[in-house]
């Protein structure tokens, strides 16, 4: 049974009975604010396998593990997130382990596990097997690992049952609880899921399956579910719905909402059943559930009751999806996030007009403002104190405003202000003045030439490539040696490269300051000989793949407060040579007579060029006598563990708890004072925690119904 659209269980633990028949929760699952400690052992929901949005647990007294409640929860899709997170476990006072031993995939979003005083078995879970990116996971304020003594199944008896992986250079066993290992699929399955018996599932399965290579036996679907089958796309006359299943027209027409009138019901557009026509489209007549393109602009006006809309997470940006005109002010304050640039573009990329001001501050996750890719007019009907309608303050990684060669932006009224944007070149700001028509409005202190761009190489020269050589998995490139006015200002070069099937990439594509960067980076030192041109060998590349490459000179950025010149190249597109293809897949042979074999196979996953033919070789095999000698029921004894070498952890025996090493001396001494940067980082961390906590409280505390 599909339950939804979102389930909120609060105050009374018996409300959990609402989950009794759910196999899929279409929407979110909240379990929260159950203050009386209860015995949850009689509550078990083995049918539940998928949550399409997110799972939030908050202040549920007496709950010690989620494993008994949701033994078969396999996938959290994260189609909609809770403040960038698909799994939130917050202030669960009695939770001892997560225990979701069948959880195999969180499709989108990160996890936040915070302030759970008794929670262990966090370091034993390898989240990289479940999530694509673990860098934005936030696991803080739980029971210290040293107090946990987490032991995976069998380790006490020296018969470990779990598999090992490496996290933070630590190779260890992976498990959810003292008796549940973390499931890992054989490497032969690649990105495919697998059964309990380690057989690979059908490619359309996600998480797990009950039978191998069968698209009707999936626990969850990688793409879409329709009539019992996992399909890569919805069949004709059916439509994608909520990111996971296919529904018919009648289904879509019969979705109701208490918030809107029936004339604003769901529509069908571009093969999807959705809440409203996307931007640029309008309903095809008053009683139609189909969308047609607008003639000219068809604005969707979004208004913020409180006048100023704060964008501090993907969730808050989600509220602006489809908006073309924003009536009010935008305050952008993005400190961190997963894949933030593309997520923000997804939700805010259609905004064309902001009637008030735009303020971007403390947005350390942003490298560029290009996510506002359609912004063309800031009216400045409301302005900040000092008559500012565009205000950019303290964005530590902001390097680009917009691509001014392809951008027309007008600021109708008000001034611009820029300060403490250390990677934003002043030339970029001056260019914005010209494009937006604000030149002459700003007074001297509005664009600070000292603290904008102070840590940037503000490029003005072009580096030219001199040669390129390719092999199947290598590219060798050289470029002209850059000569700044003072050769001592040139430190090194950085080469950026990435796969680029099409010649349409830009320097800031998919880039944010939180590690989401589609470019690989390699530093290149200056050749000692001044006459040798710098160059690099890029290796480990894929055969027959087009790469985009560009080079930047790394220069000293300040000389007595004057910005010095930097340099970078244009983007070069270059394809590696073809190579031997990988092995053909799924080779099957069957005999249909005493003198014939029929052999079938699928193309290789990596053709490494244009395939022209296959070579099939065969030979008669003698039967191997060894096959009969080996006892396949016996398991070879595997060395289990490395024993301790007799040394004792200093921290456990020293009298003085302050054991940091200061200066050149070894041994206990006082902790070094924190640097300003560390203090600032701690302050920001605390602030970020507060922002999340406020968001959580604002989201879940609602007035009691009358």
């Amino acid at each position: 049974e599909i339950c939804g659209p979102g389930i909120d269980i609060r105050n009374d633990y018996q409300q959990l009975k609402r989950l009794e028949n759910c196999t899929v929760i279409e929407g979110y699952l909240h379990i929260l604010l159950i203050s009386k400690a209860e015995d949850y052992r009689s509550y078990r929901f083995p049918k539940l396998t998928v949550i399409t949005e997110y799972l939030l647990l908050f202040r549920v007294a007496g709950l010690e593990s989620l494993g008994d409640l949701f033994p078969n929860l396999t996938v959290i899709r994260g189609w909609k997130l809770f403040y960038n997170y698909a799994l939130v476990i917050f202030e669960m006072t009695n939770l001892k382990d997560i225990g979701l031993y069948n959880l195999r995939n969180i499709t989108r979003g990160a996890i936040r596990i915070e302030k759970n005083a008794d929670l262990c078995y966090l370091s034993t879970v390898d989240w990289s097997l479940i999530l694509d990116a673990v860098s934005n996971n936030y696991i803080v304020g739980n029971k210290p690992p040293k107090e946990c003594g987490d032991l995976c199944p069998g380790t006490m008896e020296e018969k470990p049952m779990c598999e090992k992986t490496t996290i933070n250079n630590e190779y260890n066993y992976r498990c959810w609880t003292t008796n549940r290992c973390q499931k890992m699929c054989p490497s032969t399955c690649g990105k495919r899921a697998c059964t309990e018996n380690n057989e690979c599932c059908h490619p359309e399965c996600l998480g797990s399956c009950s039978a191998p290579d069968n698209d009707t036996a999936c626990v969850a679907c990688r793409h879409y579910y329709y009539a019992g089958v996992c399909v890569p796309a919805c069949p004709p006359n059916t439509y994608r719905f909520e990111g996971w299943r296919c529904v018919d027209r009648d289904f879509c027409a019969n979705i109701l909402s208490a918030e809107s009138s029936d004339s604003e019901g769901f529509v069908i557009h571009d093969g999807e059943c959705m809440q409203e026509c996307p931007s640029g489209f309008i309903r095809n007549g008053s009683q139609s559930m189909y969308c047609i393109p607008c003639e000219g602009p068809c604005p969707k006006v979004c208004e913020e009751e409180k006048k100023t809309k704060t964008i501090d997470s993907v969730t808050s940006a989600q509220m602006l999806q489809g908006c073309t005109i924003f009536k009010g002010n935008l305050l952008i304050n993005i400190r961190r996030g997963n894949n933030i640039a593309s997520e923000l573009e997804n939700f805010m990329g259609l905004i064309e007009v902001v009637t008030g001001y735009v303020k971007i501050r403390h947005s350390h996750a942003l490298v560029s403002l290009s996510f506002l890719k359609n912004l063309r007019l800031i009216l400045g009907e409301e302005q900040l104190e000092g008559n500012y309608s565009f205000y950019v303050l303290d964005n530590q990684n902001l390097q680009q405003l917009w691509d001014w060669d392809h951008r027309n932006l007008t600021i109708k009224a008000g001034k611009m202000y820029f300060a403490f944007n250390p990677k934003l070149c002043v030339s970029e700001i001056y260019r914005m003045e010209e494009v937006t028509g604000t030149k002459g409005r700003q007074s001297k202190g509005d664009i600070n030439t000292r603290n904008n761009g102070e840590r940037a190489s503000c490029e003005s020269d072009v580096l030219h490539f001199t040669s390129t050589t390719t092999s199947k998995n290598r590219i060798i490139i050289t470029w002209h040696r850059y000569r700044p006015p003072d050769y001592r200002d040139l430190i090194s070069f950085t080469v950026y490269y990435k796969e680029a099937p099409f010649k349409n990439v830009t320097e800031y594509d998919g880039q944010d300051a939180c590690g989401s960067n589609s470019w690989n980076m390699v530093d290149v030192d200056l050749p000692p000989n001044k006459d040798v041109e710098p160059g690099i060998l890029l290796h480990g590349l894929k055969p027959w793949t087009q790469y985009a490459v560009y080079v930047k000179a790394v220069t000293l950025t300040m000389v007595e407060n004057d910005h010095i010149r930097g340099a970078k190249s244009e983007i070069l597109y270059i394809r590696t040579n073809a190579s031997v293809p990988s092995i053909p897949l799924d080779v099957l042979s069957a005999s249909n007579s005493s003198s014939q074999l029929i052999v079938k196979w699928n193309p290789p996953s990596l053709p490494n060029g244009n395939l022209s033919y296959y070579i099939v070789r065969w030979q008669r095999q003698p039967q191997d006598g060894y096959l009969y000698r080996h006892n396949y029921c016996s398991k070879d004894k595997i060395p289990i563990r490395k024993y301790a070498d007799g040394t004792i952890d200093i921290e456990e025996v020293t009298e003085n708890p302050k054991t940091e090493v200061c200066g050149g001396e070894k041994g206990p001494c006082c902790a070094c004072p924190k640097t300003e940067a560390e203090k600032q980082a701690e302050k920001e961390e605390a602030e970020y925690r507060k922002v999340f906590e406020n968001f959580l409280h604002n989201s879940i505390f609602v007035p009691r119904p009358e």
Partner: antibody, heavy 118, light 107 residues
Framework: EVQLVQSGGGLVKPGGSLRLSCAAS????????MHWVRQAPGKGLEWISV???????YYADSVKGRFTISRDNAKNSLYLQMNSLRAEDTAVYYC????????????WGQGTTVTVSS | EIVLTQSPGTLSVSPGERATLSCRAS??????LHWYQQKPGQAPRLLIK???QSLSGIPDRFSGSGSGTDFTLTISRLEPEDFAVYYC?????????FGQGTKVEIK
């Protein structure tokens, strides 16, 4: 033929419970929102509840907290669980597939009588 | 919730005459108003949907008009089988609501 067949009515004491059922045939049940409407003796029609295709449920204030609408798409069935029944809940109860904003004819069940009396 | 008020409560008309029934909504409901006919012991029967759209199988002497808050059902020439109770129903906003009904009786 599109039809809805109701069952489960009867006499019940105040405070008691009753479960009404409605079996659908002749159309793709899971693709339609389903309603319950009642009519007290000699009175007008009163809309009481709906369950949409996602399983979202909505109720009239007069029954909120006491009645629960549910559906079993595998069995093509609609249910109304009525708890804490009162004398004023005495009525003929109809299950209905009402047309929506976009298109569609109504389909009504034959009605089933619920009498709440001590 | 949206309140629908029907008038008159009872309408006495002779067969062959014209009958005009009114339904007023407490707030704008666009065209999301539907008219039903109900005879004793029977389930309601839909006559007009979305204020003015006629349905197949319904005699064309039944017509509807209006939008927003004021709606009218007109029966151009009353036939003996038309004497019944008529209800308006709004589906614009949840919870759905019905009017209290207009009884059309033989004069």
């Amino acid at each position: 033929e599109v039809q809805l067949v109701q069952s489960g009515g009867g006499l019940v004491k105040p405070g008691g419970s009753l479960r009404l059922s409605c079996a659908a045939s002749g159309f793709t049940f899971s693709s339609f929102a389903m309603h319950w409407v009642r009519q007290a003796p000699g009175k007008g029609l009163e809309w009481i509840s709906v369950i949409d295709t996602r399983g979202a449920t909505y109720y009239a204030d007069s029954v909120k907290g006491r009645f629960t609408i549910s559906r079993d798409n595998a069995k093509n069935s609609l249910y109304l669980q009525m708890n804490s029944l009162r004398a004023e809940d005495t009525a003929v109860y109809y299950c209905a597939r009402l047309g929506n904003f976009y298109y569609g004819h109504d389909v009504w069940g034959q009605g089933t009588t619920v009498t709440v009396s001590s | 919730e949206i309140v629908l008020t029907q008038s008159p409560g009872t309408l006495s008309v002779s067969p062959g005459e014209r009958a005009t029934l009114s339904c007023r909504a407490s707030q704008s409901i666009g065209s999301s108003l539907h008219w039903y006919q109900q005879k004793p012991g029977q389930a309601p029967r839909l006559l007009i949907k979305h204020a003015s759209q006629s349905l197949s199988g319904i005699p064309d002497r039944f017509s509807g008009s209006g939008s927003g808050t004021d709606f009218t059902l007109t029966i151009s020439r009353l036939e003996p089988e038309d004497f019944a109770v008529y209800y308006c129903h709004q589906s614009s906003r949840l919870p759905h609501t019905f009017g209290q009904g207009t009884k059309v009786e033989i004069k």
